[in-house]
């Protein structure tokens, strides 16, 4: 089975690597533009240079290409808590990330928000905070995990999943209540 190729991929596959087929003359293969540049004019003929121009400030191309325009630099999303790790250059897009002791939560493949790593108060760190994953906590006796925080078993209602973890405490409270009534 031959994988489905788009028109552009089909045209490019006719030429050797690093070249593309001239859009007006399919007998000519033009050299692609280096990263950091874009296609201003196709090569006039075989063996002649492609006219490539450097990307302007605020734009980039990260690989060899025959794009008519450079790509706009990404902006880090301040409202998502993102910070700029490295600024955009002609051959590399802006790199955005999170501050120290934060991790990325991806809402979609292209959108992440920064959240503070859990500190595991009233518990211990089972797995350290990673770039894309919060700390995994294990709670001390008398505490249960709720929304990745160790909460006192005194906040455990019988209907919640914490009842198994907090069963001894709940029984003790119940016992105390029972012994107090005559």
């Amino acid at each position: 089975l031959v994988p489905h190729l788009g028109d552009r991929e089909k045209r490019d596959s006719v030429c050797p690597q690093g070249k593309y087929i001239h859009p007006q003359n399919n007998s000519i293969c033009c050299t692609k533009c280096h990263k950091g540049t874009y296609l201003y004019n196709d090569c006039p003929g075989p063996g002649q240079d492609t006219d490539c121009r450097e990307c302007e400030s605020g734009s980039f191309t990260a690989s060899e290409n025959h794009l008519r325009h450079c790509l706009s630099c990404s902006k880090c999303r301040k409202e998502m808590g993102q910070v700029e790790i490295s600024s955009c250059t002609v051959d590399r897009d802006t790199v955005c990330g999170c501050r120290k002791n934060q991790y990325r939560h991806y809402w979609s493949e292209n959108l992440f928000q920064c959240f503070n790593c859990s500190l595991c108060l009233n518990g211990t760190v089972h797995l350290s905070c990673q770039e894309k994953q919060n700390t995994v906590c294990t709670c001390h006796a008398g505490f249960f995990l709720r929304e990745n925080e160790c909460v006192s078993c005194s906040n455990c209602k019988k209907s919640l999943e914490c009842t198994k973890l907090c069963l001894p405490q709940i029984e003790n409270v119940k016992g105390t209540e029972d012994s107090g009534t005559t």
Partner: nanobody, 120 residues
């Protein structure tokens, strides 16, 4: 067929409260992050709030922080938006949206919207 049906909009006085609901069907609701997005008259779309599949992560636009609360009930396949201390600038059509799994768009399904009017 994926369906998102918003309800709970209406006319409310400044300082008042409303609770929007979004009933979801046609997909496994508990596996997807959801969002509320609004469009004020003559303006573009604005992200209001997001919630992830299990409710552990939320996002709020600065304009609604501390006033709006997003929540979900996966057993009822329903998304909520509790809106308190409403202001005139909150007047908009509020849409419930499902996050997309593709890179092409942030959201792949939208509700028809519910109108919220804040006016005295």
């Amino acid at each position: 067929e994926v369906q998102l049906l918003e309800s709970g909009g209406g006319l409310v006085q400044p300082g008042g409260s409303l609770r929007l609901s979004c009933a979801a069907s046609g997909f496994t609701f508990s596996m997807y992050s959801m969002a509320w997005v609004r469009q004020a008259p003559g303006k573009g779309l604005e992200w209001v709030s997001f919630i992830d599949f299990d409710g552990l992560h939320t996002y709020y636009a600065d304009s609604v922080k501390g006033r709006f609360t997003i929540s979900r009930d996966n057993s009822k396949n329903t998304l909520y938006l509790q809106m308190n201390s409403l202001r005139a600038e909150d007047t908009a059509v509020y849409y419930c949206a499902k996050f997309s799994t593709s890179t092409m768009a942030l959201f792949d399904y939208w509700g028809q919207g519910t109108l919220v009017t804040v006016s005295s």
